[in-house]
Amino acid sequence: ASTGETPNLGEVVVAEVGWDALKLNWTAPEGAYEYFFIQVQEADTVEAAQNLTVPGGLRSTDLPGLKAATHYTITIRGVTQDFSTTPLSVEVLTASGLNDIFEAQKIEWHEGTHHHHHH
């Protein structure tokens, strides 16, 4: 595996919020990652996170199959060869019904400052 630095992700934003889905946007250096690893975890539950991966050329994805009026923590990592970036997270509350689409609140996003180096 390469020992070079893997660049950090920029920021992650919930662009659209519905009652059963949302759209996630993020920024990242061009060509830096093979794919992005996204985990969608329902807050305050021991249920397994929903995992998905997105090709490294994309900067946006839909996250379907969510529950209405539910808090989620969404975590994204960039992955290339044997490296993964520090996770970047955003918390979101899905809408309670069709009338509330796009009005659910995005709570915050935060990122770590160090890379994970996998041996």
Epitope: Y35, L52, T53, P64, Q81, D82, H118
Partner: antibody, heavy 121, light 107 residues
């Protein structure tokens, strides 16, 4: 060229466990998902679960939750699938595969040669 | 888990026929939908990825379409070597799921 080589055929008694291995060569192992797919005689394909070695945690189909454990050893580029409490309906060919769409976006899918597991008393 | 309902489960057709197979997802998926062909005793072979992209080396008579919850595989003019079983695979949200399969037989 990626190659996935699986362990040999197994005959097991009902109630026992089986552990099948899948050794990858010819490409990066850690960051690509390995899935396990089974096919009972004359039946369709069933996705059992998968793992991305770099993250370690596996995903399992609901049907197999609690009975299957998928692990990966990055040092030997080998993935494992262990199925417990075997019953006759678990008689099948078990494939490991690198499948497009789950932590892998390459031009081709890669499949192991399959491991036949027979459960019989 | 997302359920993938594939239809029909089997069909009889003649060489030259146009054949369409459908897969319906129990919820919206991210169009990471593949179609596979399997012949007896062999591992499956991918024909289509991302719902409509043709796998390199696969004849252009195969095409994929659809989005959201409904997807199709069409064989525009069935050839002798196309008699096989076809599966859809949703692999964009984990756990992944296969359709039940469609066996294409000679009429």
């Amino acid at each position: 060229q990626v190659q996935l080589v699986q362990s040999g055929a197994e005959v097991k008694k009902p109630g026992s466990s089986v552990k099948v291995s899948c050794k990858a060569s010819g490409g990066t192992f850690s960051s690509y998902a390995i899935s396990w797919v089974r096919q009972a005689p004359g039946q369709g394909l069933e996705w059992m679960g998968g793992i991305i070695p770099i993250f370690g945690t596996a995903n399992y189909a609901q049907k197999f939750q609690g009975r299957v454990t998928i692990t990966a050893d990055k040092s030997t580029s080998t993935a494992y699938m262990e199925l417990s409490s075997l019953r006759s309906e678990d008689t099948a060919v078990y494939y490991c595969a690198r499948l497009y769409g789950y932590a892998y976006y390459g031009a081709f899918d890669y499949w192991g040669q399959g491991t036949t597991v027979t459960v019989s008393s | 888990d997302i359920q993938m309902t594939q239809s029909p489960s089997s069909l009889s057709a003649s060489v030259g026929d146009r054949v369409t197979i459908t897969c319906r997802a129990s919820q919206g998926i991210r169009n990471v939908l593949g179609w596979y062909q399997q012949k007896p005793g062999k591992a499956p072979k991918r024909l289509i990825y991302d719902a409509s992209s043709l796998q390199s080396g696969v004849p252009s008579r195969f095409s994929g379409g659809g989005s959201g919850t409904e997807f199709t595989l069409t064989i525009s003019s069935l050839q002798p070597e196309d008699f096989a079983t076809y599966y859809c695979l949703q692999n964009g949200l984990q756990p992944a799921t296969f359709g039940q399969g469609t066996k294409v037989e000679i009429k």
